[in-house]
Interface confidence: low
């Protein structure tokens, strides 16, 4: 339905508070280097303009598209060329090319300082002094570091952030109350950002069809009692929401997400029995709750899939009449019967089924040709099952830190050209699959593990895309979205890699390591481990373990010494010499 003024429409739908927050997120995600105060000024100007349009939709410029209004506003930033370089050229373009240009310049790894958490009393004072500015700053800092963060979900995080400070700043022990909550929000926020980044990559790199297939599989697992038509409607609406958010249309995205939540709750009887509690919550909590809701129970006595998709004489006729609908039905029927499979496995099965029909429906005897199609699924199912079993056994044997180290070595040997910080970040996250998923029973392990690995490997893909250094990474990232994990799993040691020159400076450590948190100390050690492998890709597990054990002992010893810096200097030289000898460097 057309509105005379799009900006007035969205302002009225969303309300002033959400409107301002979403515009701030949009601007911070586009201009990631701009100071907070500049963004606040731009947001206030846009908000005042929106209010004039609410008062009179025929007022000057009120009929312009949101992209035009927001793009014009962003292009008024004085320091655009100095701060952003060629991104300033976007401003010479017309819509819709200008917005596409801004999107292409979003930086997944912006050169921004790490967010350091101030003392609790300092944070509480800032919160009490100016709550509104404090919360806006949270939105700004998260949005600029995570330019694809799902904007309506960020509003939900901000609400929880506010609630944490409201509760804890008046608690007897502020730190004990607040810090676990902030840790939880940080960890959940990183996970949410990474999950959304995969959705956007799916849409932008592989197209709407790929995203819709993912959504059919996931929603069919979650809502197995819903009819195919109902699932299809939800998929269409969900695709619109994520297309908008990934495209920077955050006001439309938030508005449409609210409409979708409303629809789901009004029709929960035909969707899922698990939605009741979610639907009693306020809007932001409701949308989050629906997105995370547990799978409904499978309907009893579902018939065999073979009848409709293998034994029926109409398979090729049905396929020819409406290929995507028929494949969608296959995916829906398979997924609702298999909450124990990962979404990517279900998509691989659907792709195998599609390839078989493409071949067989052109054959002399189609039925004879596709009769054994389900037999082709067996190895596809067993591959992730076996991989998860092996890796969970390894995780349970080693614990998280050493499991991460095993993955660091494995992935550095596969793709040694990738930057050390990226290898450390990605391997640490890959290693977290153990604590996240291995505790689950068999039936929940695969969807937990393989779909999580898809999210983490997408981080590798988007970081690598910014500065491509490895043809192998490019190949695994671009050939097939659903086969990324098997592609990386199948990579062996890169025999073409020329080992890095040994640089003693890389292995020189100072007393500051002693004051680091356990996590930061682990990262230092893991960085050294990656560098070791880059110098000596053929080093055995035993050799690397010996060097890392020596390194841990060295750090522990020097951190206990009276003169720490001297200890690090003298013992460090000995360690480097011993390591070189041990590895034959």
């Amino acid at each position: 339905d057309a509105h005379k003024s799009e900006v007035a429409h969205r302002f009225k739908d969303l309300g002033e508070e959400n409107f301002k927050a979403l515009v701030l997120i949009a601007f911070a995600q586009y201009l990631q280097q701009c100071p907070f105060e500049d963004h606040v000024k731009l947001v206030n100007e846009v908000t005042e303009f929106a209010k004039t349009c609410v008062a009179d939709e025929s007022a000057e410029n009120c009929d312009k598209s949101l992209h035009t209004l927001f793009g014009d506003k962003l292009c008024t930033v004085a320091t655009l060329r100095e701060t952003y370089g060629e991104m300033a050229d976007c401003c010479a373009k017309q819509e819709p090319e200008r917005n596409e240009c801004f999107l292409q310049h979003k930086d997944d790894n912006p050169n921004l300082p790490r967010l350091v958490r101030p003392e609790v009393d300092v944070m509480c004072t800032a919160f009490h002094d100016n709550e509104e500015t404090f919360l806006k700053k949270y939105l700004y800092e998260i949005a600029r570091r995570h330019p694809y963060f799902y904007a309506p979900e960020l509003l939900f995080f901000a609400k929880r952030y506010k609630a944490a400070f409201t509760e804890c700043c008046q608690a007897a022990d502020k730190a004990a109350c607040l810090l676990p909550k902030l840790d939880e929000l940080r960890d959940e926020g990183k996970a949410s950002s990474a999950k959304q980044r995969l959705k956007c990559a799916s849409l932008q790199k592989f197209g709407e069809r790929a995203f819709k297939a993912w959504a059919v599989a996931r929603l069919s697992q979650r809502f197995p009692k819903a009819e195919f038509a109902e699932v299809s409607k939800l998929v269409t609406d969900l695709t619109k929401v994520h297309t908008e958010c990934c495209h920077g249309d955050l006001l439309e995205c938030a508005d449409d997400r609210a409409d979708l939540a409303k629809y789901i709750c009004e029709n929960q009887d035909s969707i899922s029995s698990k939605l009741k509690e979610c639907c009693e919550k306020p809007l932001l909590e409701k949308s989050h709750c629906i997105a995370e809701v547990e799978n409904d129970e499978m309907p009893a006595d579902l018939p065999s899939l073979a009848a409709d998709f293998v034994e029926s004489k109409d398979v090729c006729k049905n396929y020819a009449e409406a290929k995507d609908v028929f494949l969608g039905m296959f995916l829906y029927e398979y997924a609702r019967r298999h909450p124990d499979y990962s979404v990517v496995l279900l998509l691989r099965l659907a792709k195998t089924y599609e390839t078989t029909l493409e071949k067989c429906c052109a054959a002399a005897d189609p039925h004879e040709c596709y009769a054994k199609v389900f037999d082709e699924f067996k190895p596809l199912v067993e591959e992730p099952q076996n991989l998860i079993k092996q890796n969970c056994e390894l995780f349970e044997q080693l614990g998280e830190y050493k499991f991460q180290n095993a993955l660091l070595v494995r992935y550095t040997k596969k793709v040694p050209q990738v930057s050390t910080p990226t290898l450390v970040e990605v391997s640490r996250n890959l290693g977290k699959v153990g604590s996240k998923c291995c505790k689950h029973p068999e039936a929940k392990r695969m969807p937990c593990a393989e779909d999580y690995l898809s999210v983490v490997l997408n981080q590798l893909c988007v970081l690598h895309e910014k500065t491509p250094v490895s043809d192998r990474v490019t190949k695994c990232c671009t050939e097939s979205l659903v086969n990324r994990r098997p592609c990386f799993s199948a990579l062996e040691v890169d025999e073409t890699y020329v080992p890095k020159e040994f640089n003693a400076e890389t292995f020189t450590f100072h007393a500051d390591i002693c004051t680091l948190s356990e996590k930061e100390r682990q990262i230092k050690k893991q960085t050294a481990l990656v560098e070791l492998v880059k110098h000596k890709p053929k080093a055995t597990k035993e050799q690397l373990k010996a060097v890392m054990d020596d390194f841990a002992a060295f750090v522990e010893k020097c951190c206990k010494a009276d003169d720490k810096e001297t200890c690090f200097a003298e013992e460090g030289k000995k360690l480097v010499a011993a390591s070189q000898a041990a590895l034959g460097l």
Epitope: E184, E396, E400, S435, C438
Partner: nanobody, 115 residues
Framework: EVQLVESGGGLVQPGGSLRLSCAAS????????MSWVRQAPGKGLEWVSA????????RYAESVKGRFTISRDNSKNTLYLQMNSLRAEDTAVYYC????????GGQGTTVTVSS
Amino acid sequence: EVQLVESGGGLVQPGGSLRLSCAASGFTFGSFGMSWVRQAPGKGLEWVSAIDSGGADTRYAESVKGRFTISRDNSKNTLYLQMNSLRAEDTAVYYCTIGRSASRGGQGTTVTVSS
């Protein structure tokens, strides 16, 4: 199925002691950090203490430091909380949980400190 069963709560006078236990099953206990959290009547969940998977690293909320000791026995899949010098404000339902999230684990065990 992950299960956490807390026990050892009860009524105790101010200054007294209690030892809480948490029996874990359904996951590899020795691979995970564990925490105790508590919920006083009419209040939200409060994080009390945490311990890493091997038992070497322990953390405490300021309000219990020096009075409570967290420990674990990985061979028995059990987490413990030794509570000494109990005060009225320690009255709460105590839960053990995987990791360091301030979320409930099992059914909890009630500790009442009153004279």
